[in-house]
């Protein structure tokens, strides 16, 4: 049974140019996290964390994300077409797959927010 | 459009290292993907055995830990395989390939290794 | 480790025939699955990532399906540049692991 639950950054902006922390945390759960997957809002993967093979950053995406912190990843020299959706998948034993959602908002203005708060999706 | 290619000798003596290098031309190895090697057994069994990341660091199949090693020169666009104390079991042809998401997109074209006194 | 069981270990099929390969991880690894076909004296060649994505510049008539631990390579409408042989891989753990391969030769 899947007990656990995932908590996402939810709905963050930041400042183009600049860089945003993608982060999800899955908690209430004893599972064995075996990998995590970040998607962009058209579904291409960004990079792969697996338990066992460390790290995989998709190479068009090598100059602007860093893996990290922890399970999660960093935006870097956003742009305004890095508005939308981004997805953490999270495969874990015995329970299975957890999902998260975050939506980036990326501001021509220099008062950009970083709205950071954890919350439940 | 990019190539790997395997070199090194076809023969080694028992107990002593086999070195070989894989040559990759039209792409640099510090821009993305895995770079690995892989050997296929003259019983059509294949293995993989470790690879080395853009940024140089590795992993390895448990059951060679002890004595395989990969590293790279960036400047030449090289990297290589060293496998220590063989035997007549680490005969095999040995492949070096371009790793995404650790499957296998491009693959050189193989070298036969030896292990013979 | 995850063990990958590949079935039949050869098969004997004609010209314009569909075939069926299939392969069996001992644990679940999602879609985390490739194939790839190696003839004669050549390196392998990838035919399909995660399951069922077919590899740039490669034939339609391929196509991989399955999930979990239960995945198919199906071969439509063999060709004679099709015969040689075909292995799966895991892609999602230490060590990457292959099955034992399947030979497709000519009736």
């Known amino acids: 049974m899947m007990t656990g639950t995932i908590e996402t950054t939810g709905n963050i902006s930041a400042k183009k140019g600049g860089s945003v922390i993608l982060q999800c945390h899955l908690s209430s759960t004893m599972a064995q996290v075996t990998q995590v997957n970040w998607e962009q809002h058209d579904h291409s993967l960004l990079a792969i964390r697996n338990a066992e093979l460390g790290w995989h950053i998709y190479p068009a995406f090598k100059d602007r994300v860093a893996p990290g912190p922890g399970l999660g990843l960093t935006l870097q020299s956003l742009t305004m077409n890095d508005t939308g959706e981004y997805f953490c998948t999270y495969h874990t034993y015995p329970d299975g797959t957890y999902r998260g959602r975050i939506f980036l908002e990326v501001l021509e203005s220099s008062v950009a927010e970083h709205s950071a708060r954890f919350q439940i999706p | 459009d990019v190539q790997l290619q395997e070199s090194g000798p076809g023969m080694v003596k028992p107990s002593q290292s086999l070195s070989l290098t894989c040559t990759v031309t039209?792409?640099?190895?510090?821009?993305?993907?895995?770079w690995h090697w892989i050997r296929h057994f003259p019983g059509n069994k294949l293995e993989w055995m470790g690879f080395?990341?853009?940024?140089?660091?590795?992993k390895y199949n448990p059951s060679l830990k002890s004595r395989i090693s990969i590293t790279h020169d960036t400047s030449k666009n090289h990297f290589f395989l060293k496998l220590n104390s063989v035997t007549s079991e680490d005969t095999a042809t040995y492949y070096c390939?371009?790793?995404?998401?650790?499957?296998?997109?491009?693959w050189g074209t193989g070298t036969t290794v030896t292990v013979s006194s | 480790d995850i063990q990958m069981t590949q079935s039949p270990a050869s098969l004997s099929a004609s010209v314009g025939e569909t075939v069926t390969i299939t392969c069996r991880a001992s644990?679940?690894?999602?879609?985390?699955l490739a194939w790839y076909q190696q003839k004669q004296g050549k390196s392998p060649q990838l035919l399909v990532n995660?399951?069922?994505t077919l590899a740039e510049g490669v034939s339609s008539r391929f196509s991989g399906s399955g999930s979990g631990t239960q995945f198919s390579l199906k071969i439509n409408s063999l060709q004679p540049e099709d015969f040689g042989s075909y292995y799966c891989?895991?892609?999602?753990?230490?060590?990457?692991?292959f099955g034992a391969g399947t030979k497709l030769e000519l009736k």
């Open positions: 390939a371009r790793g995404s998401y650790w499957y296998f997109d491009v």
């Open positions: 891989q895991h892609h999602y753990g230490n060590p990457l692991m």
């Open positions: 039209g792409y640099s190895i510090t821009s993305g993907y895995d």
């Open positions: 080395i990341s853009d940024s140089g660091s590795t």
């Open positions: 995660n399951a069922k």
């Open positions: 644990e679940n690894i999602y879609s985390y």
